[in-house]
C-alpha cells in the first residue's frame, strides 16, 4: 500500500496545501469540481496544491470542514452565569457541581479498576501462552525475536511489568542474559502502548473526538515503534544499553531498598481483590520450563497458606546429583538423596468472585475481558459526558491555557521538558503508564489537551514506569537485585536515548505527524483503527516470531524485500514530494498502481460489505453496545440510537449523511445533543463552573 | 510371615553356568529389592547385584558384570540368579535377601543360601 | 568401591563387658552404614541401619554411633548369646560392600 491512505493525481506547489492525511487544512476544494473523478487513473482530476512533505496524497472524496481538525474545539458555556443566579441557583449549583465531582472521581476509579481487571483477564486468556513465548530457546541469539516476544507477551498480559519481571527473574536464574533481555524490554516498552490505544477505541461514536484520541493514544505506539526501529539496530551493533548500565550497576554498591509505593493499588486493589486474584508466579514459572505450572490454574484459590519445609527421601540418577555426598545413599539399584520441600498446607480460601467456580482460565479471562470492556467503555462515555459538562467557558479556558500553553519567550522550550517531567511523576503515583496514558486519552479526544502536549506527556509516562521499576529493582533479594537493576536501567536509558531522538528537535517530532495521519484516517475509516491494532500488536509481530522460528534465512529472505519495498516507497515519496522533476512522468504520482493499493476507499467498500449484515441491528441496542458496533459499521449518525437504523437506511439509498464536527458547534453539549446523543433539555439546565 | 526358600546346593565343573532360584511368599514379590550376597568358605560377606521384580532393574557389583544374570518370574513370585564362567574361587554360599526398609541398602530378611561348589 | 575397614578381626570379652567394634570408610559415606551379626552356621541377621537405628526385635544393649568414615558399633553388656561374626555394610554407593567381620568371642 502507498504510505497515505488516499493517492490522487496532484501537483505540488510549495505555497499552497491541502491537508492530505495529516496536518492542516485551512481551505478545501470545492467538491462540485471533482465530480468527474473515477477509479480510472487516466481520467483528468483536478489539479490540488499540496505542502511538498505531503507528497502526492489526497483523501478522496475528503468530506469539507471549515476548520482544522486539529484545532481544540470551543469549550463554550450555553447555561446561566454565576452572577445571574439566585442564592437557591447558586446552592444548587454548587452542590451539582460538587455531585459531578463526586461521579467524576467514582467513574475514574472504576476506569482504574477495569484497567486492572482487563489486565487479569488478558494474562488469564493469554498469560500462559505468553509465559511459553519465554521458553523458547532462540531469544539468545536472535534480537528481533526477542522484540516480537516483548511485544507479544506485554499484549497478551496487558502488563509491561509482568512482562518484565518475568525476564528479570530469568536472566537472575541465568536462562536468558541481559544482552537478550534487552530486545524484550524494548518490546514490552511497544506492547505496554496498547492499552490506550484499545481506550481510544472507545471514543469512537464521534469521528472528530475519536480523530484526537487516536491520534493521542497512537502517538505512543508511533515513539516507541520508531524509537526501536533506530535503536535496536543501534543496540545489537554497538550493545551501548548493555555497557552504561552494566558500567552503572557495577560502580555503585547497592543496598536493597524499600518496595515502590503502591498508591493507586492501595486504593484499588480492595475492589479489584474481589473481582479475580491471580497467582501471577505461574507465567513465570512456565517461562523457566517448569513443567507443572503448565497445568497450574492463574486464579488463586487459597489466599492463606501454611508453608512447613520438610526433608525428603528422592531418586537421583547419579551420585554427582545428590544434595552432598554425605546426604547419598543406595537401595541397590537407586541413588537416593535427601531433598528439603516445602510443604504447603492451605488455611483459607481468597475472598473473589470465581473462587469457588472451578471455571477453566480462559472462561474466566473471556468473562472477565468481556466485562471489563463493558465497564471500560461505559466510564468512558461517562467520564467525557462529565468532562463535557463541566469543562466549559471560564474553567474550560483556565485549563486549556494551563496546560496547553508554553512558557513566554525564551523559555518556550523548557515547558515540553516540564510536561515531560509532570508525566514521569503522574505516572510515578499511578505505579502505570497504562494507567496515566488511559487517562490521558479521553482529555485529548474531548480537547482538553492538544497531542502536541500530550505527546512530552506521554514520553514522561514512559519514563516514569522505569523510575517504578528501578525502584522495585532496589527492593529485589540479593541474587536478582543485579539482574533486575541493570534491566530496569536499560528500560530507563533506552527510553531517554528514544526522547533524544524524538523530541528536543522539532523536526524529529515525528510520532506527532503519524499519529496525527492515523487519526484522520481512523476518523474517516473507523474500521482501520481496529484493523491497525490487529497488525501492529498481533500480526506483525506473530509473522516475526514465526519467521524467526523457521531460522535466519527465511527470517533475512522474507524480511529483507519487504524492507527494500518500504525503502523504496518512502524514497519515491520523498521524491514525489520534494523534487518530482527528476522522475518520470509516470512515478510522480500513485496513480499507476491499481486504487486498491492506493486507496482505502476499494478496501472500505469490503469491509462495508461483511459490516452490512450488522447494519441494520448494529444501533438497535444499547449506547454502549452501540458504540462498538460504530466502529465496524462506520455508521455516520451511530450514538443516535433510536434514529440509527432509519439513517443507516437513507445511507444506503446513497445519501451521505455528513456529521457536523462538534468544534463548529458553540459546545460539546450541542454537538452531541445535534447528533441525537444528550436530550436538547440537558442543554438548558447546564452549571456553569466557577 | 516373609520366608526366602533358595534352590539345592550344586557341584559344577569350572567354566560352567550355575543358575539358582529363590522362591518368595509372605510379602509381594513386586514391592521390594532382592539382593544376592555371596559368602566364600571362613570369609566375609561380598555382594554381588540387585534386582528390583516391579520393574526389572538391576544394578551389579563391577566384579560380577558379564558373568551373572539376574531375572525375576513375578508370576512365581521367584528370583533367579546365573551365574556364568565359574572358576574355583566362585566357590560359596550365595544368599537371597530383601530390604523391606524402604530406600536403603540394608537387607533384612535372607534366604537359606546355596553352596554351590566348583570342582574339577 | 567403597573400602569398609572392620577392627579388631576378632575379640575375646567377659558376660558383661562393653564392647565395642569400629569400622572406617575409604570415603564419605553419610549414615548409610548397616551391622548385621552372623551367628555360626546361620545367615546374616540386621542388627542396624542408618548407623544408629535398630531394627525390630534387636535388643536395646547394641547401640551404633558414627558419620562420615568413622562408625561403631556397642553391645553395652555382652551376653553369651551375642558370640557371632558381626559385620558393617555400606551402602551410601554402588557396590554395597562389607566390611571383613569382626569375630566376638566369650572369655
Known amino acids: 500500500m502507498a504510505p497515505w491512505p488516499e493517492l490522487g493525481d496532484a501537483q505540488p506547489n510549495p505555497d499552497k496545501y491541502l491537508e492530505g492525511a495529516a496536518g492542516q487544512q485551512p481551505t478545501a476544494p470545492d467538491k462540485s469540481k471533482e465530480t468527474n473523478k473515477t477509479d480510472n487513473t487516466e481520467a483528468p482530476v483536478t489539479k490540488i496544491e499540496l505542502l511538498p512533505s505531503y507528497s502526492t496524497a489526497t483523501l478522496i472524496d475528503e468530506p469539507t470542514e471549515v476548520d482544522d481538525p486539529w484545532n481544540l474545539p470551543t469549550l463554550q458555556d450555553s447555561g446561566i452565569k454565576w452572577s445571574e443566579r439566585d442564592t437557591k441557583g447558586k446552592i444548587l449549583c454548587f452542590f451539582q457541581g460538587i455531585g459531578r465531582l463526586i461521579l467524576l472521581l467514582g467513574f475514574l476509579y472504576f476506569f482504574v479498576c477495569s484497567l486492572d481487571i482487563l489486565s487479569s483477564a488478558f494474562q488469564l486468556v493469554g498469560g500462559k501462552m505468553a509465559g511459553q513465548f519465554f521458553s523458547n530457546s532462540s531469544i539468545m541469539s536472535n534480537p528481533l525475536l526477542g522484540l516480537v516476544i516483548g511485544v507479544l507477551v506485554t499484549v497478551l498480559v496487558q502488563s509491561s511489568s509482568t512482562s518484565t519481571s518475568i525476564v528479570v527473574s530469568m536472566v537472575s536464574s541465568s536462562l536468558l542474559t541481559v544482552r537478550a533481555a534487552i530486545p524484550i524490554i524494548m518490546g514490552a516498552n511497544i506492547g505496554t502502548s496498547i492499552t490506550n490505544t484499545i481506550v481510544a477505541l472507545m471514543q469512537v461514536g464521534d469521528r472528530s473526538e475519536f480523530r484526537r484520541a487516536f491520534a493521542g493514544a497512537t502517538v505512543h505506539d508511533f515513539f516507541n515503534w520508531l524509537s526501536v526501529l533506530v535503536l535496536l539496530p543501534v543496540e545489537v551493533a554497538t550493545h551501548y544499553l548493555e555497557i552504561i548500565t552494566q558500567l552503572i550497576v557495577e560502580s555503585f554498591h547497592f543496598k536493597n531498598g524499600e518496595d515502590a509505593p503502591d498508591l493507586l493499588k492501595v486504593i484499588t486493589k480492595p475492589f479489584t481483590k474481589l473481582i479475580v486474584q491471580l497467582d501471577k508466579k505461574v507465567i513465570s514459572q512456565i517461562a523457566m520450563n517448569d513443567e507443572k505450572a503448565k497445568n497450574k490454574s492463574l486464579v488463586k484459590i487459597w489466599c492463606k497458606t501454611f508453608t512447613n519445609k520438610t526433608q525428603i527421601n528422592v531418586t537421583v540418577p547419579s551420585t554427582a546429583n545428590c544434595t552432598s555426598p554425605s546426604l547419598c545413599w543406595t537401595d541397590g539399584i537407586q541413588n537416593w538423596t535427601m531433598k528439603n520441600v516445602t510443604y504447603k498446607e492451605n488455611i483459607a480460601k481468597c475472598q473473589h468472585i470465581f473462587v469457588n467456580f472451578h471455571l477453566p482460565d480462559l472462561a474466566v479471562g473471556t468473562i472477565l475481558l468481556i466485562l471489563s470492556l463493558l465497564v471500560l467503555c461505559g466510564c468512558l462515555i461517562m467520564i467525557v459526558k462529565i468532562l463535557g459538562s463541566v469543562l466549559k467557558g471560564q474553567v474550560a479556558t483556565v485549563i486549556k491555557k494551563t496546560i496547553n500553553t508554553d512558557f513566554p519567550f525564551p523559555f518556550a522550550w523548557l515547558t515540553g521538558y516540564l510536561a515531560i517531567l509532570v508525566g514521569a511523576g503522574m505516572t510515578f503515583i499511578v505505579q502505570s503508564s497504562s494507567v496515566f496514558t488511559s487517562a490521558l486519552t479521553p482529555l485529548i479526544g474531548i480537547g482538553v489537551i492538544t497531542i502536541e502536549r500530550a505527546y512530552p506527556l506521554t514520553l514522561g509516562s514512559n519514563i516514569g514506569t522505569t523510575t517504578t521499576a528501578i525502584l522495585a529493582a532496589l527492593a529485589s533479594p540479593g541474587n536478582a537485585l543485579r539482574s533486575s537493576l541493570q534491566i530496569a536501567l536499560c528500560h530507563f536509558f533506552f527510553n531517554i536515548s528514544g526522547i533524544l531522538l524524538w523530541y528536543p528537535i522539532p523536526f524529529t517530532r515525528l510520532p506527532i505527524r503519524m499519529a496525527k495521519g492515523l487519526g484522520n484516517i481512523s476518523a474517516k475509516y473507523r474500521w482501520f483503527a481496529v484493523f491497525y491494532l490487529i497488525i501492529f500488536f498481533f500480526l506483525i509481530p506473530l509473522t516475526v516470531f514465526g519467521l524467526s522460528l523457521a531460522g535466519w534465512r527465511v527470517l533475512v529472505g522474507v524480511g529483507v524485500p519487504v524492507v527494500f519495498i518500504i525503502i523504496l516507497v518512502l524514497c519515491l515519496r520523498l521524491l514525489q514530494s520534494r523534487c518530482p522533476r527528476v522522475l518520470p512522468k509516470k512515478l510522480q504520482n500513485w496513480n499507476f498502481l491499481p486504487l486498491w493499493m492506493r486507496s482505502l476507499k476499494p478496501w472500505d467498500a469490503v469491509v462495508s460489505k461483511f459490516t452490512g449484515c450488522f447494519q441494520m441491528r448494529c444501533c438497535c441496542c444499547c449506547r454502549v453496545c452501540c458504540r462498538a458496533c460504530c466502529l465496524l459499521c462506520d455508521c455516520p449518525k451511530c450514538c443516535r440510537c433510536s434514529k440509527c437504523c432509519e439513517d443507516l437506511e437513507e445511507a444506503q439509498e446513497g445519501q451521505d449523511v455528513p456529521v457536523k464536527a462538534p468544534e463548529t458547534f458553540d459546545n460539546i453539549t450541542i454537538s452531541r445533543e445535534a447528533q441525537g446523543e444528550v436530550p436538547a433539555s440537558d442543554s438548558k439546565t447546564e452549571c456553569t463552573a466557577l | 510371615q516373609v520366608q526366602l526358600v533358595q534352590s539345592g546346593a550344586e557341584v559344577v565343573k569350572p567354566g560352567a553356568s550355575v543358575k539358582m532360584s529363590c522362591k518368595t511368599s509372605?510379602?509381594?514379590?513386586?514391592?521390594?529389592?532382592m539382593h544376592w550376597v555371596r559368602q566364600a568358605p571362613g570369609q566375609g560377606l561380598e555382594w554381588i547385584g540387585a534386582?528390583?521384580?516391579?520393574?526389572?532393574?538391576?544394578s551389579y557389583n563391577q566384579k560380577f558384570k558379564g558373568r551373572v544374570t539376574l531375572t525375576a518370574d513375578k508370576s512365581t513370585s521367584t528370583a533367579y540368579m546365573e551365574l556364568s564362567s565359574l572358576r574355583s574361587e566362585d566357590t560359596a554360599v550365595y544368599y537371597c535377601s530383601i530390604s523391606t526398609i524402604i530406600t536403603t541398602g540394608a537387607v533384612d530378611y535372607w534366604g537359606q543360601g546355596t553352596l554351590v561348589t566348583v570342582s574339577s | 568401591d567403597i573400602q569398609m575397614t572392620q577392627s579388631p578381626s576378632s575379640l575375646s570379652a567377659s558376660v558383661g563387658d562393653r564392647v565395642t567394634i569400629t569400622c572406617k570408610a575409604s570415603?564419605?559415606?553419610?549414615?548409610?552404614v548397616a551391622w548385621y551379626q552372623q551367628k555360626p552356621g546361620k545367615v546374616p541377621k540386621l542388627l542396624i541401619y542408618w548407623t544408629s537405628t535398630r531394627h525390630t526385635g534387636v535388643p536395646s544393649r547394641f547401640s551404633g554411633s558414627g558419620s562420615g568414615t568413622d562408625f561403631t558399633l556397642t553391645i553395652s553388656s555382652l551376653q553369651p548369646e551375642d558370640v557371632a561374626t558381626y559385620y558393617c555394610q555400606q551402602y551410601s554407593r554402588i557396590p554395597l560392600t562389607f566390611g571383613g567381620g569382626t569375630k566376638v568371642e566369650i572369655k
Open positions: 570415603q564419605d559415606v553419610g549414615t548409610a
Open positions: 534386582i528390583y521384580p516391579g520393574s526389572g532393574d538391576t
Open positions: 509372605g510379602y509381594t514379590f513386586i514391592t521390594y529389592n
